[in-house]
Amino acid sequence: QAVPPYASENQTCRDQEKEYYEPQHRICCSRCPPGTYVSAKCSRIRDTVCATCAENSYNEHWNYLTICQLCRPCDPVMGLEEIAPCTSKRKTQCRCQPGMFCAAWALECTHCELLSDCPPGTEAELKDEVGKGNNHCVPCKAGHFQNTSSPSARCQPHTRCENQGLVEAAPGTAQSDTTCKNPLEPLPPEMSGTMLM
């Protein structure tokens, strides 16, 4: 098993993740591990020399970079917030602020926008990842209602009047809850749509 640096006639190295082909010397050399950078390039007589990234800089992968990448804060102006700080091995981890979704993506989210409101009678379809896309509003399923314009309100089950010792005065809709009344009192016309105790 050859240890870098070693000769490579076909310009490929055995371990593509941890080695790279250096064309001037026509050899395979070690890459530097995450959290480090190349402080001295390899040659036929010595392997790559690596050094640790300085504070506030990082390299995420096995690399042959001669510098570390500068840590960047999550930009609140772009609607981003930090979920994990930058380390020598990983860039700052950002996500969209609550109530926002990612509107521009370039390897990572660069710009978040406010989620659209879902109108009464609908709710935002649940997604695998929060903040990945704008709301897709879906109607409340049978027996549920949602009575506000909101990006985050969920459809709630209609009140079951009998569970409260009451009777139904008016059925619930997708946009309103069931109206209940005391079974002993008739519902005056002007009180319809409200619950009487």
Epitope: A7, E9, P23, R26, S43, R44, I45
Partner: antibody, heavy 120, light 107 residues
Amino acid sequence: EVQLVESGGGLVKPGGSLRLSCAASGFTFSDYYMYWFRQAPGKGLEWVATISDGGSYTYYPDSVKGRFTISRDNAKNSLYLQMSSLRAEDTAVYYCVREENGNFYYFDYWGQGTTVTVSS
Amino acid sequence: DIQMTQSPSSLSASVGDRVTITCKAGQDIKSYLSWYQQKPGKAPKLLIYYATRLADGVPSRFSGSGSGTDYTLTISSLQPEDFATYYCLQHGESPWTFGGGTKLEIK
């Protein structure tokens, strides 16, 4: 038989330009890294430029970086050295050289050389 | 850059003599050293590569030895055609560097 024949040398004024050529024959030119070396009158040998087999990579010592450009045309089996901003210290015999393409990296064939004189 | 110190810079010897030329590298060059012979007005000619290996067509009176930082070219029995200048070259690390040369003259 491997042959490397340089041409294009001559007398040039300081600050001037010159293009050297090297015609290769007797081997598969596109399989080899090629080099230019030089030798000033009565002096030792000095590496000047390297180009990879496909021409994608070029390398220079600090003494010529930014002034000299090595290139190749594999279809024509030709190597070139474009020299600009020439100085008196660039006066030398320039050799076109082939690097062995195995694992030992020695320089196995040299051209006869072409003379470049930089003088006012 | 790796400095190559070649000695002697000139040497007078007679036909039949055994001659030794040395090259000292500024650091371990792992045998990436070759030797070249150059006659006046001619291009250098490869003699030895990888410190000890004889190039094709080179007479067996030429030999190379050494490792690490110290290398030697030996001509076991000088012939008239051997009077020339000899150069060592390290090609372990760019920039490639030559020794200053040894001019071998007839005594």
